[in-house]
Amino acid sequence: APVPPGEDSKDVAAPHRQPLTSSERIDKQIRYILDGISALRKETCNKSNMCESSKEALAENNLNLPKMAEKDGCFQSGFNEETCLVKIITGLLEFEVYLEYLQNRFESSEEQARAVQMSTKVLIQFLQKKAKNLDAITTPDPTTNASLLTKLQAQNQWLQDMTTHLILRSFKEFLQSSLRALRQM
């Protein structure tokens, strides 16, 4: 499911709970995606030794995964709500091609990979409703994404495993940085 079912199982259910606010819904959606990533990382780490590999830098050079930097306005110093929100949405849109790449990379967690992808689309919609300056959000070029996907899928097995590991790790970090910033808004 692209949206978490009811309350997080680890959360405390309060009787007659108020409907979730927009911010709470976004927070919960991110936590739901993080759960999915955690499950996917388990399979990746069990299947290969990528999680302990020191050769990450080699593969990382070929990937242009979104990352939070101070200039993006999401850090405490220079925090800027609108700039930060644009960065979060833009980053998530850029991750979509990498999430598409993950779709055929899992055996036992195929549904989980699909859930992460669909939940991210829902999260983007939530955030777009929150953003005032939608014009500042640049959507990735579909042609560029298509050729990137082809290139990633043409890699040898070791590089594909490493790419999967790096995407999951970077996506997790990006979501955590986003979660932290959104809680300030």
Partner: antibody
């Protein structure tokens, strides 16, 4: 296993700058979701949160002490440093460093150093 | 800042008793609440995070619950090693703030 240990002067004169170092092992800032914070406790009183530094070098400070505090880290040495300027007798307390590690950033402090008393 | 108030400030109890400590937040903090135990001369020790999640290794006699902005720590059958001071901490908004503590004696 996870350990943290604070070090620094036990005695500081008024107006001086206090520099405290937290050396840790068993985890690193390479893991997203990790943060290390400083908390102090005056003798017989409650805990007061001071500052925190994240895996990606973002920082948070207590607003009431923001102008006096600086938190930094050295990832290669696995240490976090807190400096506090313009010390005053009211700053007498046990200073703790503590770790938080949580995917959802709930900031519960799961491992603490033994604390260092600064007078 | 989110102000955390704790009651009672101290409580006398005997081994085997059920003890309840309450913490109130001055504003909504969702489920961002932790409980710590501290013994004299020692650092605090995390017992419960996210209102009711028991930290690994913490005895099941400790439990946490929430009702709005009121949070409760319950010790069902007090053991000799449970006599200590208990602090709550909100972790929803910066600055992170602690309650004044409840001394269990």
């Amino acid at each position: 296993q996870v350990t943290l240990k604070e070090s620094g002067p036990t005695l500081v004169k008024p107006t001086q700058t206090l520099t405290l170092t937290c050396i840790f092992s068993g985890f690193s800032f390479k893991t997203s979701g990790v943060s290390v914070g400083w908390i102090r406790q005056p003798p017989g009183k409650a805990l007061e949160w001071l500052a925190l530094i994240y895996w990606d070098d973002d920082k948070r400070y207590s607003p009431s002490l923001k102008n006096r505090l600086t938190i930094t880290r050295d990832t290669s040495k696995n240490q976090v440093v807190l400096t506090m300027t313009n010390m005053d007798p009211v700053d007498t307390a046990t200073y703790y460093c503590a770790r938080s590690y949580d995917d959802y950033l709930y900031y519960a402090l799961d491992y603490w150093g033994q604390g260092t008393l600064v007078t | 800042d989110v102000v955390m108030t704790q009651s009672p400030s101290s409580v006398s109890a005997s081994v085997g008793d059920r003890v309840t400590i309450t913490c109130r937040a001055s504003q909504d903090i969702d489920n961002f609440l932790a409980w710590y135990q501290q013994k004299p001369g020692k650092a605090p020790n995390l017992l419960i995070y996210k209102v009711s999640s028991l930290r690994s290794g913490v005895p099941s006699r400790f439990s946490g619950s929430r009702s709005g902005t009121d949070f409760t720590l319950t010790i069902t059958s007090l053991q000799p090693e449970d006599f200590a001071t208990y602090f709550c901490q909100q972790t929803r908004r910066f600055p992170l703030t602690f309650g004044p503590g409840t001394k269990l004696e």
